[in-house]
């Protein structure tokens, strides 16, 4: 999404959530 937009995209599955969690946790260590 570009800055200034309203983003309403829904993920059809929870599978990709694992990748998001992983990325979020990786940021913690920065």
């Amino acid at each position: 999404s570009s800055t200034g937009s309203i983003d309403m995209v829904d993920s059809p599955q929870l599978a990709t959530l694992a990748d998001e969690v992983s990325a979020s946790l990786a940021k913690q260590g920065l």
Epitope: S1, S11, T16, E20, V21, S24, K27
Partner: antibody, heavy 116, light 111 residues
Framework: QVQLQESGPSLVKPSQTLSLTCTVS????????VAWVRQAPGKVPEWLGA???????YYNPALKSRLSITRDTSKSQVSLSLSSVTTEDTAVYYC??????????WGRGLLVSVSS | QAVLTQPSSVSGALGQRVSITCSGS?????????VGWYQQVPGSAPKLLIY???SRASGVPDRFSGSRSGNTATLTISSLQAEDEADYYC??????????FGSGTRLTVLG
């Protein structure tokens, strides 16, 4: 510094839609995920869903039919909408940076009561 | 009903070592190091202590540590302080439910 603040009505009538907004500062809702968590009085926290940094939205399957999460990048806001509320939806609603296992900064929370 | 099981209460004396367990399944705790631990004082928002099962969050004293083995995660406080008295929750990614919290543990510090 990183901050999140929930806003919205503190009282909602049964069968109506609960709408809350989380306004963030100190980070970008584009590059970081924002989760919504609620906690009924005296109960355990419950994960509602999240707006991922990818732009995808993720929902608690038990609530997915009633729940909608949207992200407005221009206002640094993530909003939550919960339809057809009942008294069981009375809780403190939190937004927080992260998704579930590493939610590092939380809003103060907003107590929403569902009552006629 | 919480998917992750914790003891409802634990207690220990000042300076004592205590551990809180969080038992789940292969779809959550056993899925990987996607586990966090939170401390909550009544009336306040949860505070992140441990992320990624074993990493201490910024500013958290080193007396707090976390580990995971199979479907069980453990939070250990090596030397109890009076200010540690609070409720503790584990939380995990769940491949079916998205995100789940534990049943919660009330920690009481004695004496």
């Amino acid at each position: 510094q990183v901050q999140l603040q929930e806003s919205g009505p503190s009282l909602v009538k049964p069968s109506q839609t609960l709408s809350l907004t989380c306004t963030v500062s100190g980070f970008s809702v584009i590059s970081d995920s924002v989760a919504w968590v609620r906690q009924a009085p005296g109960k355990v926290p419950e994960w509602l869903g999240a707006s991922g940094s990818s732009g995808n939205k993720y929902y608690n399957p038990a609530l997915k039919s009633r729940l909608s999460i949207t992200r407005d990048t221009s206002k640094s806001q993530v909003s939550l909408s919960l339809s057809s509320v009942t008294t069981e939806d009375t809780a403190v609603y939190y937004c927080a940076r992260g998704i579930i296992a590493g939610v590092d900064v939380w809003g103060r929370g907003l107590l929403v009561s569902v009552s006629s | 009903q919480a998917v992750l099981t914790q003891p409802s209460s634990v207690s220990g004396a000042l300076g004592q070592r205590v551990s809180i367990t969080c038992s789940g399944s292969s779809s959550n705790v056993g899925y990987g190091d996607y586990v966090g631990w939170y401390q909550q004082v009544p009336g306040s928002a949860p505070k992140l202590l441990i992320y990624g099962a074993a990493s201490r969050a910024s500013g958290v004293p080193d007396r707090f540590s976390g580990s995971r083995s199979g479907n069980t995660a453990t939070l250990t406080i090596s030397s109890l302080q009076a200010e540690d008295e609070a409720d503790y929750y584990c939380a995990s990614y769940d491949s079916s439910d998205g995100g789940v919290f534990g049943s919660g543990t009330r920690l009481t510090v004695l004496g």
